[in-house]
């Protein structure tokens, strides 16, 4: 049994910015659940984190460098990411994983966003290449 | 109290297989990957590789990736590694840990170890 | 894969000194930086999570820093039961790897 998911077909990031809307065809509430934002066709690049659990606050994090932040709907998780740089428009899937209860369940592939990123052209500093929120 | 604990020392000749299990209470099993960590003596630590027993994804290092395998039972909570085609090597302490599925980045609990040595 | 290398590999040290191990990474890393200690015949256990988090029950004069490539791990004042070996470990991509080892002395 797989869980389904609905994006935006494409989506632009005027000023470097975006909300990416994952919407599941799955009541998260009361679930403990990971999850994330998958860049390139491939998915190699996991962007951002949502790990939601009944018993504590979203915890939400990047460790591949994004600015981002995540907000849970009963049905939805939406991603906020900040601070996007013009090669990074991509494609970009939604995933999502249920860990409790059991059993584990996750999502057929959706067909993804397309984010073109527009707009300021962010260019790093020589100290901080790139953006480093966790 | 969260306890991950290791079945017994093995003794294995070259060539021979090793099966070592680890067994988990004291949490939700399927909330945590089960990472395989060795350490030959007087020697730093080596990640071998990882299993998530919610979908039995796993994830091996390279070095040990055609002779490790790694199971998981969860109806009895338990983790296996087993290493193929031993060499003397391998003598080593084995210790299973577990890092949060949701949280992946530290190992926060541990087995007590098991010791393998292999020898003619 | 990340390479991880710790610096020095052994030190010698008194009880009350303060003690700074480091830890440096082959490519950014971001925060994802733990640190273990290591007493003989007993398995590691978790002492700094994410660069700076103390791990639950973890004393107060161990401290944690460091972002991108270069981590340091701070003992405030060396305990009896701080001499030991000391790992880090990056957490940001698989394979996980661990540095070499920092075994603490006592002088």
């Known amino acids: 049994n797989k869980i389904l998911v609905k994006q935006s077909p494409m989506l632009v990031a005027y000023d470097n910015a975006v909300n990416l809307s994952c919407k599941y065809s799955y009541n998260l509430f009361s679930r403990e659940f990971r999850a994330s934002l998958h860049k390139g066709l491939d998915s190699a690049v996991e962007v951002c984190v949502v790990y939601g659990n009944y018993s504590q606050q979203l915890q939400v994090y990047s460790k591949t460098g994004f600015n981002c932040d995540g907000k849970l709907g009963n049905e939805s998780v939406t991603f906020y990411l900040q601070n996007l740089y013009v090669n990074q428009t991509d494609i970009y899937f939604c995933k999502i994983e249920v860990m409790y209860p059991p059993p584990y369940l996750d999502n057929e592939k959706s067909n993804g966003t397309i984010i073109h990123v527009k707009g300021k052209h962010l260019c790093p500093s020589p100290l901080f290449p790139g953006p480093s929120k966790p | 109290q969260v306890q991950l604990v290791q079945s017994g020392a093995e003794v294995k000749k070259p060539g021979a297989s090793v099966k070592v299990s680890c067994k988990a209470s004291g949490y939700t099993f399927t909330s945590y990957y089960i990472h395989w960590v060795r350490q030959a003596p007087g020697q730093g630590l080596e990640w071998m590789g990882s299993i998530y027993p919610g979908n039995v994804n796993t994830n091996y290092n390279e070095k040990f990736k055609d002779r490790v395998t790694l199971t998981v039972d969860t109806s009895i909570s338990t983790a296996y590694m087993e290493l193929s085609r031993l060499r003397s090597d391998d003598t080593a302490v084995y210790y299973c840990?577990?890092?949060?599925?949701?949280?992946?980045?530290?190992?926060?609990?541990w087995g007590q170890g098991t010791t393998v040595t292999v020898s003619s | 894969d990340i390479q991880m290398t710790q610096s020095p590999s052994s030190l010698s040290a008194s009880v009350g000194d303060r003690v700074t191990i480091t830890c440096h990474a082959s490519?950014?890393?971001?925060?994802?930086l733990n640190w273990y200690q290591q007493k003989p015949g007993k398995a590691p256990k978790l002492l700094i999570y994410?660069?700076?988090n103390l791990h639950t029950g973890v004393p107060s004069r161990f401290s944690g820093s460091g972002s991108g490539t270069d981590f340091t791990l701070t003992i405030s004042s060396l305990q009896p039961e701080d001499f030991a070996t000391y790992y880090c470990q990056q957490g940001q991509t698989y394979p996980y790897t661990f540095g070499g080892g920092t075994k603490v002395e006592i002088k």
């Open positions: 840990t577990r890092s949060h599925y949701g949280l992946d980045w530290n190992f926060d609990v």
């Open positions: 490519q950014n890393i971001y925060v994802w």
């Open positions: 994410k660069a700076s």
